[in-house]
Amino acid sequence: SPVPPSTALKELIEELVNITQNQKAPLCNGSMVWSINLTAGVYCAALESLINVSGCSAIEKTQRMLNGFCPHKVSAGQFSSLRVRDTKIEVAQFVKDLLVHLKKLFREGQFN
């Protein structure tokens, strides 16, 4: 049976916690990704940004989980208007920012 949205979001949050906690070397070798607007469509926008990082096993599970939240197909190189124009940040900072935002969404009951 499908996982309730609240459970899925909780699991995504916990996965992001694990990523930030287990950082030994720079996450994804210090790869940079496009910063996103966190106010709307955050799951698809986050996936569109992170999908461009390849060969980084640490975020593969996060990419799969975000895919489950995003209603449309996302492929590398694709980017919506949710990108913050010409601003790139390290994957580690992207994950930290995303984590705090998702915790706030969970508090607000915005599970999908």
């Epitope: 916690v17 930030t20 705090v100 508090r107």
Partner: antibody, heavy 122, light 108 residues
Framework: QMQLVESGGGVVQPGRSLTLSCAAS????????MHWVRQAPGKGLEWVGV????????HYADSVKGRFTITRDNSKNTLNLQMNSLRAEDTAVYYC???????????????WGQGTMVTVSS | SYVLTQPPSVSVAPGETATITCGGN??????VHWYQQKPGQAPVLVIY???DRPSRIPERFSGSNIGNTATLTIEDVEAGDEADYYC???????????FGGGTKLTVL
């Protein structure tokens, strides 16, 4: 200015009851979750309970569950804490505090009252 | 129920940096708030939602929350920062708000 003022504290015998009140002013009371927090002499902060903005939900700490009841009157901007079957370990300063209300009550307490002392002693 | 662990005391010289920790199982998955309480006064919110700062709180105060530890950092400590500091989270599993035991910050 925004203010919370507690009242109703005092000395009460074990097993008896007491009701504390918290009067809110300077903000839209009905849009905030309201909490009670207590602090025994020389000890840390202990959360007592919360009532949602519309009064539809309450949650309590295990230590007071079944003995304490939180109510509110949004038309009068007041919060109440009815304390029954009081014990010596309930002796503390009692604070009311507000927190913006979301789906879950995980918000920080951005406004506190000055506190009212409750002493449970025979 | 959920438990938050703080060191009972932290001492620091004026001008130095104070670090106060708050430990909890996977606390990084929760939003952490920090309060300052001076003797005889009500607590005051100094950090909310892990790292946000109310407008009236100096930039010297900052917060972080990773893994099993949340941290309150006070840079360039002043005598006026001497107080008790408490961390706080909402425990979704028990529908209760939880405070840490508190840390007494002493400015030497």
């Amino acid at each position: 200015q925004m203010q919370l003022v507690e009242s109703g504290g005092g000395v009460v015998q074990p097993g008896r009851s007491l009701t504390l009140s918290c009067a809110a002013s300077g903000f839209e009371f009905r849009t905030y979750g309201m909490h009670w927090v207590r602090q025994a002499p020389g000890k840390g902060l202990e959360w007592v309970g919360v009532i949602w903005d519309d009064g539809s939900n309450t949650h309590y700490a295990d230590s007071v569950k079944g003995r304490f009841t939180i109510t509110r009157d949004n038309s009068k901007n007041t919060l109440n804490l009815q304390m029954n079957s009081l014990r010596a370990e309930d002796t503390a300063v009692y604070y009311c505090a507000r927190a913006p209300q979301w789906y879950l009550t995980a918000e920080a307490f951005d406004l506190w009252g000055q506190g009212t002392m409750v002493t449970v002693s025979s | 129920s959920y438990v938050l662990t703080q060191p009972p005391s932290v001492s620091v010289a004026p001008g130095e940096t104070a670090t106060i920790t708050c430990g909890g199982n996977l606390i990084g998955a929760k939003l952490v708030h920090w309060y300052q309480q001076k003797p005889g006064q009500a607590p005051v919110l100094v950090i909310y939602d892990d790292s946000d700062r109310p407008s009236r709180i100096p930039e010297r105060f900052s917060g972080s929350n990773i893994g099993n530890t949340a941290t309150l950092t006070i840079e360039d400590v002043e005598a006026g920062d001497e107080a008790d500091y408490y961390c706080q989270v909402w425990d979704y599993s028990s529908d209760t708000m939880v405070f840490g035991g508190g840390t007494k910050l002493t400015v030497l």
